[in-house]
Interface confidence: medium
């Protein structure tokens, strides 16, 4: 299944020119004095896409990104000169690259930038209602951005703003060595991960942060960070990268005597995404590039989609793996990784685990501790020396749902849309690459609903020149995809059913869950429409069963796949 879908050819391959010709892409090609359109914030309510870039923040209309407003937020000449004298590149580094863009409250956003190696944050007024049409920088109130935005524009911040508190995974120093997960803003003292302890974080690169409830009690809410980092010595022979998921309790206020203003509930586990190799050695996709959470009916259990690439320069490959939160929780409730000294191997901890179990949030649900400051000393001591779990998190079905090798590109971004089709629900993945293309892929169950087959529906070139796709957002309301790169921002529809041809058979063979034959054309499928009048078969793509003679119009022999 993953093997036979390994290098499946797209049913539809559209060059940038073809996208243009068929009016399927709108591109904002950037400003001459800006670049790096990497930080996205989607606001479906206001129908805006906020984009942070070099010296600018944009507010694009989701209907059509041609309609936009912009805020210019450069650094002062003094700051730029200081940065230049520090030996930094005036164009690529000595500017304000926006790294954090989060909704602060009903009327304001919170934004942070590198500030020419002097991180800075401020608030942006967006008004109560879309019709207010407000988009302005609160330039009377700037805040120190240390621990919020990195100093270096080459680094990313994973951020999340909830209840007036900013969680961020970033580098907190000029040299880009002190990586930490912070909580700032709000009324409490800032909290961070333990400093200078490679067991906690070992030169990480943060991807994203998400709030996921643990139970029906909000006190148990956890913030999960996804990142990749260097494997700790003894965990792997030689230098290697590991993909990680880290957890923190939202109500963690640090310890009382030890781990003061440090997380007491931080735990991390390795995310495995691998395939068995021909020689019995697994091929690992360890370089986590992006994560997308697909919400389910149960807010406690979203499906985690991860995009990974290989670390090896010899073997270039990409994969998508899916994880369930129940598997993640099982690992965090499993054995802790332990070693007796720097020259020892990591083993599962066999001794007594103190109570309450490290990593458990203080709440009425799981025990009688109201605050992390009340935790017993042995819990804090154990937490400090055992931040990692021994067991890794394996993907659903123990394997990737999609891999791509022997191609000249690698995956960089992913968003997923859950689509209702005639024969069930399908997850459609939109995968961005480092050459400016987007792959549209549908997971179709084979014999069982657990065994998935990947169908590569479309490969679309969305930027004129090859460029790494560094941000992606999907608007279910607008049925549009928004893509960011160094060069600019692109917008494209999630579906273009008319492109699948003029016959029922072609429409059916496309196996695109967005599309069905309506009797006269291939058009958007809506589950509310009368089933009898719509021909669609995603699972099998069988036109003979689903297309009446009238629908096929004797044109079965005409069906073709565009390449």
């Amino acid at each position: 299944n993953y093997a036979n879908g390994k290098n499946n050819v797209p049913r539809l391959k559209l060059s940038y020119k073809e996208m243009l010709e068929s009016n399927n892409v709108i591109t904002f090609n950037g400003l001459a004095n800006s670049s790096s359109y990497h930080t996205f914030l989607l606001d479906e309510e206001r129908s805006r896409l906020y984009v942070g870039a070099k010296d600018h923040i944009f507010s694009f209309n989701l209907v059509n990104i041609k309609d936009f407003q912009k805020i210019v937020w450069p650094v002062s000449y003094t700051r730029r000169d200081e940065c230049k004298w520090a030996g930094k590149d005036i164009l690529k580094e000595c500017a304000n690259f926006i790294k954090v863009l989060e909704a602060y409250n009903q009327t304001h956003l919170y934004a942070c930038g590198t500030g020419a190696f002097h991180p800075i944050c401020t608030y942006i007024e967006v008004g109560h209602h879309p019709e207010d049409n407000i988009f302005k920088l609160q330039d009377s109130h700037f805040e120190n951005g240390r621990g919020k935005s990195p100093y270096d524009p080459k680094l990313l911040t994973a951020s999340l703003l909830i209840d007036g508190e900013l969680y961020s995974g970033t580098a907190a120093d000029f040299m880009g060595r002190d990586f930490a997960i912070f909580r700032t803003l709000g009324h409490h003292h800032p909290i961070r991960t333990e400093q200078h302890d490679s067991r906690w974080l070992n030169d990480p690169r943060f991807i994203s942060a998400h709030l996921i409830p643990e139970s029906d009690n909000p006190e148990d809410d956890k913030v999960y960070f996804f990142f990749r980092e260097n494997a700790i010595d003894g965990e792997h022979s030689g230098k290697a990268t590991h993909a990680r998921i880290g957890q923190i309790c939202k109500n963690d206020f640090g310890g009382h005597r030890s781990l003061v203003n440090k997380w007491t509930t931080f735990l991390k586990a390795r995310l495995i995404c691998s395939v068995p190799g021909p020689n019995g050695i697994d091929t690992h996709f360890d370089e986590l590039q992006d994560v997308f959470l697909m919400n389910s009916k149960d807010p406690k259990n979203p499906i985690v989609y991860g995009v990974f690439t290989t670390s090896s320069n010899i073997f270039k490959g990409s994969a998508v793996c899916m994880y369930s939160m129940s598997d993640v929780r099982r690992v965090f409730l499993g054995p802790y990784a332990h070693r007796d000294g720097p020259n020892y191997q990591w083993v599962p901890y066999q001794g007594r685990v103190p109570y309450p179990r490290p990593g458990t949030c203080p709440s009425k649900t799981f025990g009688g501790f109201d605050s992390t400051k009340d935790l017993p000393d042995d819990v804090i001591t154990f937490a400090r020396s055992h931040p990692a779990m021994y067991n890794p998190v394996f993907p659903i079905n123990n394997r990737p749902i999609m891999i791509k090798t022997d191609v000249n590109y690698q995956f960089t971004q992913i968003v997923v849309d859950r689509v209702d089709a005639e024969d069930g629900q399908y997850d459609v993945m939109f995968i961005g690459t480092d050459v400016g293309t987007v792959l549209k892929v549908v997971s179709v169950p084979k014999e069982t609903w657990h065994d998935l087959e990947e169908i590569l529906l479309e490969e679309m070139t969305v930027f004129r020149e090859p460029t790494t796709i560094s941000a992606m957002e999907l608007s279910t309301k607008q049925q549009q995809l928004y893509i960011g790169s160094t060069a600019g921002v692109a917008q494209l529809p999630l579906h273009r059913c008319d492109i699948y041809g003029k016959a029922c058979a072609e429409c059916c063979l496309a196996r695109d869950p967005y599309c069905a034959w309506d009797g006269s054309s291939c058009s958007r499928y809506f589950p509310t429409a009368k089933a009898r009048t719509r021909a669609q078969d995603i699972r099998n793509g069988d036109p003979l069963t689903h297309c009446s003679d009238g629908g096929i119009e004797g044109r079965m022999d005409h069906h073709h796949h565009h390449h």
């Epitope: 020119k17 243009l20 591109t27 004095n33 800006s34 990104i65 912009k70």
Partner: antibody
Framework: EVQLLESGGGLVQPGGSLRLSCAAS????????MSWVRQAPGKGLEWVSA???????YYADSVKGRFTISRDNSKNTLYLQMNSLRAEDTAVYYC??????????????WGQGTLVTVSS | QSVLTQPPSASGTPGQRVTISCSGS????????VNWYQQLPGTAPKLLIY???LRPSGVPDRFSGSKSGTSASLAISGLQSEDEADYYC????????????FGGGTKLTVLG
């Protein structure tokens, strides 16, 4: 409907100045890069100057230091301030919208033009 | 002296096919897309072809563009009297700090 309407042309002596305006309507003016293109009598098209939606400006070598392009997004108007005019600046001046959203990188709409005559 | 080279004139009779060439260099046509503009007598130029060979909506399919290497051409099939106009090719030029350059223009005459 997209419309571009130039004004401000006329007869001017060498060394003199003129300010051309281009009133835009029918599209979100602030979202587009705009250009001035000229055509000397009986001759071909020559690009003169451009201004991006970010306010960045570009000039042909022949007018650099003498002409200044600007825009007032609140008035949906493009300007060309022409100083130290020479006889060779005599031409019909067109204001044109550059459609670089779809990366067509083409001037997709043009005004009807305004004639500038530099003569003593 | 125009950066892009076009023949000054071309002619054809109604119904005929006419081709106009445009020659440039590696810094313009060779590395950027080509646009064609039509200028009817006494009017402003109008975009005819963009991105080498794409037509904006409203332009008849009698007009087609092509590009090969550092040269481009515009073909008009089924020539009509209303096609009598000046035709200009244009491209962006990397060596001139990414500014647009035009051809000298070709005057198309429809005979008879």
């Amino acid at each position: 409907e997209v419309q571009l309407l130039e004004s401000g042309g006329g007869l001017v002596q060498p060394g003199g100045s003129l300010r051309l305006s281009c009133a835009a309507s029918g599209f979100t003016f602030y979202s587009y890069a705009m250009s001035w293109v000229r055509q000397a009598p009986g001759k071909g098209l020559e690009w003169v100057s451009a201004i991006g939606y970010g306010g960045d400006t570009y000039y042909a070598d022949s007018v650099k230091g003498r002409f200044t392009i600007s825009r007032d997004n609140s008035k949906n108007t493009l300007y060309l301030q022409m100083n130290s005019l020479r006889a060779e600046d005599t031409a019909v001046y067109y204001c044109a919208r550059r459609d670089d959203y779809t990366s067509r990188d083409a001037f997709d709409y043009w005004g009807q033009g305004t004639l500038v005559t530099v003569s003593s | 002296q125009s950066v892009l080279t076009q023949p000054p004139s071309a002619s054809g009779t109604p119904g005929q096919r006419v081709t106009i060439s445009c020659s440039g260099s590696s810094s313009n046509i060779g590395s950027n897309t080509v646009n064609w503009y039509q200028q009817l007598p006494g009017t402003a130029p109008k975009l005819l072809i963009y991105y080498d060979d794409l037509r904006p909506s409203g332009v008849p399919d009698r007009f087609s563009g092509s590009k090969s290497g550092t040269s481009a051409s515009l073909a008009i099939s089924g020539l009509q009297s209303e096609d009598e106009a000046d035709y200009y090719c244009a491209a962006w030029d990397d060596s001139l700090n990414d500014i647009p350059v035009f051809g000298g223009g070709t005057k198309l005459t429809v005979l008879g």
